[in-house]
Interface confidence: medium
């Protein structure tokens, strides 16, 4: 299936979706927005953690998700076909396409993402075994933390890194790929 056919099928699927079906996605988005706004109202940043965490440039990069790989593949095609679309609209279109992609067609991205995650886990284990550089140690607020607490924090850090890196990569691509 070539891209324009795939794109057509996606928009046709969306067009033929009943209001009820569409409502399901719209409700999910609304609920999530409400949750976010609710949580942000009561969110107080922990003391001493308002500064951006030190990010070691030598640390292994968080691997991209299957969806991120999919987006990278189809973003230039969408931008090529619709140069006027805003970043938000491109993202929305990609989200719709991913939701309408059959599980079989999602497999290559999921396989690749799993492989990259595996590699990342090996790399990060090796990186941690070596010990973080001094500069990174300075960024740690309390050195004496239980192993369990440390692991939890590492996981959270990884999640933050993934979000930051995806944002950064998107920014890079906006600079790089303004060429479509």
């Amino acid at each position: 299936v070539n891209f324009s056919e795939f794109s057509k099928k996606c928009s046709e699927r969306w067009k033929t979706m009943s209001a009820k079906e569409k409502g399901k996605f719209e409700d999910m988005a609304k609920a999530d927005k409400a949750r976010y706004e609710r949580e942000m109202k009561t969110y107080i940043p922990p003391k001493g953690e308002t500064k951006k965490k030190f990010k070691d440039p030598n640390a292994p990069k968080r691997p991209p998700s299957a969806f991120f790989l999919f987006c990278s593949e189809y973003r230039p095609k969408i931008k090529g076909e619709h140069p006027g679309l805003s970043i938000g609209d491109v993202a929305k279109k990609l989200g719709e396409m991913w939701n309408n992609t059959a599980a079989d067609d999602k497999q290559p991205y999921e396989k690749k993402a799993a492989k990259l995650k595996e590699k990342y886990e090996k790399d990060i284990a090796a990186y941690r075994a070596k010990g973080k550089p001094d500069a990174a140690k300075k960024g740690v607020v309390k050195a004496e933390k239980s192993k369990k607490k440390k692991e939890e924090e590492d996981d959270e850090e990884d999640e933050e890194d993934e979000e930051e890196e995806e944002e950064e990569e998107d920014e890079d691509e906006e600079e790089d790929d303004d060429d479509e």
């Epitope: 891209f3 991209p64 593949e73 479509e180």
Partner: antibody, heavy 115, light 107 residues
Framework: QVQLQQSGPELVRPGTSVKISCKTS????????MNWVKQRPGQGLEWIGQ????????YYNEMFKDKATLTVDTSSSTAYIHLSSLTSEDTAVYFC????????WGQGTSVTVSS | DIQMTQTTSSLSASLGDRVTVSCSAS??????LNWYQQKPDGTVKFLIY???SLHSGVPSRFSGSGSGTDYSLTISNLEPEDIATYYC?????????FGGGTKLEFK
């Protein structure tokens, strides 16, 4: 900065095959399309096809479907083109170029098919 | 496939001249047109995307225009480093296709 470094010139016999490489640096290889373009001596540019490294998805120009095979090695951020059953018609410079916009190009690899 | 035609295969001009390279498509391509520059040593550079948008780092003396099937690249103040062959390329429909090229030479 973004760089695409291609392998050196090739002199090959008719009927054989050749594999050209394009080693990339300065960007996330996985998440950008890689195109291949052919230029015969004194002629214009012809698009051969493109590959997306993260999924191995490919699009080929029908004219090159039976001639070229595009592959990647993500561990070394390198793209390859394999040209088979070579004839004098395949004597050309082959370029790799990044993304649909072909915003960055390799320096080209000259392939000469001669007995 | 969409055929791209650059009717002028070579152009002679002088330093400081305003030069226009034209390109036409066998059918409408909705402004999905790029321009590339190939220097005599073979290196290829991306100049313009989507008919008229300048790629980063490309001097502002380069500009592009056109619509439907007819497009052009203009160099407003010719410099020595602009001596090259210029190619148009459509990305409206796969397979991507290039024009035959226009070689720019000094008079």
């Amino acid at each position: 900065q973004v760089q695409l470094q291609q392998s050196g010139p090739e002199l090959v016999r008719p009927g054989t095959s050749v594999k050209i490489s394009c080693k990339t640096s300065g960007y996330t290889f996985l998440t950008y399309w890689m195109n291949w373009v052919k230029q015969r001596p004194g002629q214009g540019l012809e698009w051969i096809g493109q590959i997306f490294p993260a999924s191995d998805n490919t699009y080929y120009n029908e004219m090159f479907k039976d001639k070229a095979t595009l592959t990647v090695d993500t561990s070394s951020s390198t793209a390859y083109i394999h040209l088979s059953s070579l004839t004098s018609e395949d004597t050309a410079v082959y370029f790799c170029a990044r993304e649909d916009s072909m915003d960055y190009w390799g320096q080209g690899t000259s392939v000469t098919v001669s007995s | 496939d969409i055929q791209m035609t650059q009717t002028t295969s070579s152009l002679s001009a002088s330093l400081g001249d305003r030069v226009t390279v034209s390109c036409s498509a066998s059918r409408g391509i909705n402004n999905y047109l790029n321009w590339y520059q190939q220097k005599p040593d073979g290196t290829v550079k991306f100049l313009i995307y989507y008919t008229s948008s300048l790629h980063s780092g490309v001097p502002s003396r380069f500009s592009g225009s056109g619509s439907g099937t007819d497009y052009s690249l203009t160099i407003s103040n010719l410099e020595p480093e602009d001596i090259a062959t210029y190619y148009c390329q459509q990305y409206s429909k796969l397979p991507w296709t290039f024009g035959g090229g226009t070689k720019l030479e000094f008079k």
